[in-house]
């Protein structure tokens, strides 16, 4: 696994411990919490990052209406089970044997049950809607400039292929970023939209996961973009299975 060989660190994940004992005596970086080796040339999966985080703590609108099936992640943090590739396992349980099914972003998509609950597959989240509210500015940002800057950010900082950022909507002071990625579109080396969204979310909150990098500093034509509030909606390839029909808090 690649890492900065000279001083054996992981540029893309500060929640790691690196040592020169990998294959061939190379630098190997292990995610805290799970101990799994991570590829430091790309983003670490959200599941491993959440596990590491838990271990470290233990009408003319241009805006999109979230689908009735969109899930808003309100459950907060939990210590997830990751598979052998570092992705979320379909079924997650807590210490008290309460279990639930999650999507590929790790957000609950069913009612909670007991250990008899079955989750047949990890349902893929193919559409992520990131909604930001920016601090008041003297004048609204130019939509085209904002679009370009956010696309550049996702491509350069998060290594997300441009085709997966499908749209940037803007209605002052609300910005919406749409990420779309079907399983068939995602190549082996492509960053998952789930991971890009999570890194972006942590950046926005001033909790950057990148090693030694300053927090996010987005400027649109020299004007800093300060985010006051963030909401992220997740739309799965199959509707969530909650007992009440509502815009579900996941």
């Amino acid at each position: 696994h690649t890492a900065a060989q000279d001083n054996c660190t992981c540029p893309t994940n500060k929640m790691t411990v690196c040592s020169p004992d990998g294959p061939g005596g190379r630098c190997q970086c292990r995610a805290l919490g799970s101990g799994m080796a991570v590829d430091c040339s790309t983003l670490t999966s959200k599941c491993l990052l959440l596990k590491a985080r838990m271990s470290a703590r233990k009408s003319g609108r241009s805006l999109v209406m979230p689908s009735e099936h969109a899930i808003l992640d309100n459950d907060g943090l939990y210590d997830p089970e990751c598979d052998d590739k570092g992705r979320f396992k379909a079924r997650q349980c807590n210490q008290t044997s309460v279990c639930w099914c999650v999507n590929s972003v790790g957000v609950r998509r069913t009612d909670k049950g007991d250990q008899s609950l079955r989750c047949d597959e990890v349902v893929r989240t193919h559409h992520i809607l990131i909604e930001l509210r920016h601090r008041p500015t003297d004048r609204a940002f130019n939509h085209s400039d904002l679009d370009s800057e956010l696309r550049r950010l996702f491509q350069e900082r998060y290594k997300l292929h441009p085709s997966f950022l499908s749209a940037v909507h803007y209605e002052e002071p609300t910005i919406q970023i749409e990420l779309r990625q079907n399983a068939s579109q995602k190549g082996l080396r492509d960053v998952d939209i789930a991971d890009a969204a999570y890194y972006f979310e942590r950046d926005i909150k001033g909790e950057s996961l990148f090693m030694g990098r300053r927090g996010l500093d987005v400027q649109v034509r020299g004007e800093p973009l300060h985010v006051e509030r963030t909401l992220i909606y997740y739309l799965d390839e199959k509707p969530p299975q909650f007992s009440m029909k509502r815009l579900t808090a996941g």
């Epitope: 411990v17 805290l32 101990g35 799994m36 080796a37 598979d83 590739k85």
Partner: antibody, heavy 115, light 107 residues
């Protein structure tokens, strides 16, 4: 050359505690994980846990979480394992071993818990 | 936790024979498997790391292969000094685990 030095034996009473040591030399102590392994007489090897001296990060196998505590003293390049509430089940040889591939091992400390 | 199953429990061979030890993991662990030899009253000694990488000072008759879930340690011409217990160990994720071991006996 890399060396991990452990005391040969420890005799303690049931219910007591013990602190086993492992003094490292011949490499940069803070750059490699240190692991502890238990082996009861005639039995196989069991991983207890590990510690990263460069940051103090620790991990434990579930069955040893309430039994052992791993610490390091970087100034003397020494790793320690504190074992508490000892019973005869804790009588075993305890090894310290370096890095994720366990490339160097101490000679092991034979812990005997007996009244 | 990742379970490592070693087979057989005991291997009995004649000097000069080729012998193979098997280790099977309960899930895909890539090549994060290492092999150890432990002689009577001795500390374990690393023979092979990352499934197939040789170790300085270890005789060339020892070799390893495999990836994913199935791994093999081979001794291409057994010598009497090879009488020992052999363990596989995974470093894919915590908790690290060992196989139960295979005892090598000489006929």
């Amino acid at each position: 050359q890399v060396q991990l030095q452990q005391p040969g034996s420890e005799l303690v009473r049931p219910g007591a505690s013990v602190k086993l040591s492992c003094k490292a030399s011949g490499y940069t102590f803070t750059s490699y994980w240190m692991h502890w392994v238990k082996q009861r007489h005639g039995q196989g090897l069991e991983w207890i846990g590990n510690i990263y001296p460069g940051g103090g990060y620790t991990n434990y196998d579930e069955k040893f979480k309430s039994k052992g505590t791993l610490t390091v003293d970087t100034s003397s390049s020494t790793a320690y394992m504190h074992l508490s509430s000892l019973t005869s089940e804790d009588s075993a040889v305890y090894y310290c071993t370096r890095s994720s591939v366990f490339d160097y091992w101490g000679q092991g400390t034979t812990l005997t818990v007996s009244s | 936790d990742i379970l490592l199953t070693q087979s057989p429990a005991i291997l009995s061979v004649s000097p000069g024979e080729r012998v193979s030890f098997s280790c099977r993991a309960s899930q895909n662990i890539g090549t994060s498997i290492h092999w150890f030899q432990q002689r009577t009253n001795g500390s374990p000694r690393l023979l092979i790391k990352y499934a197939s990488e040789s170790i300085s000072g270890i005789p060339s008759r020892f070799s390893g292969s495999g990836s994913g879930t199935d791994f093999t340690l081979s001794i291409n011409s057994v010598e009497s000094e090879d009488i020992a217990d052999y363990y596989c160990q995974q470093s894919n994720s915590w908790p690290f685990t060992f196989g139960s071991g295979t005892k090598l006996e000489i006929k």
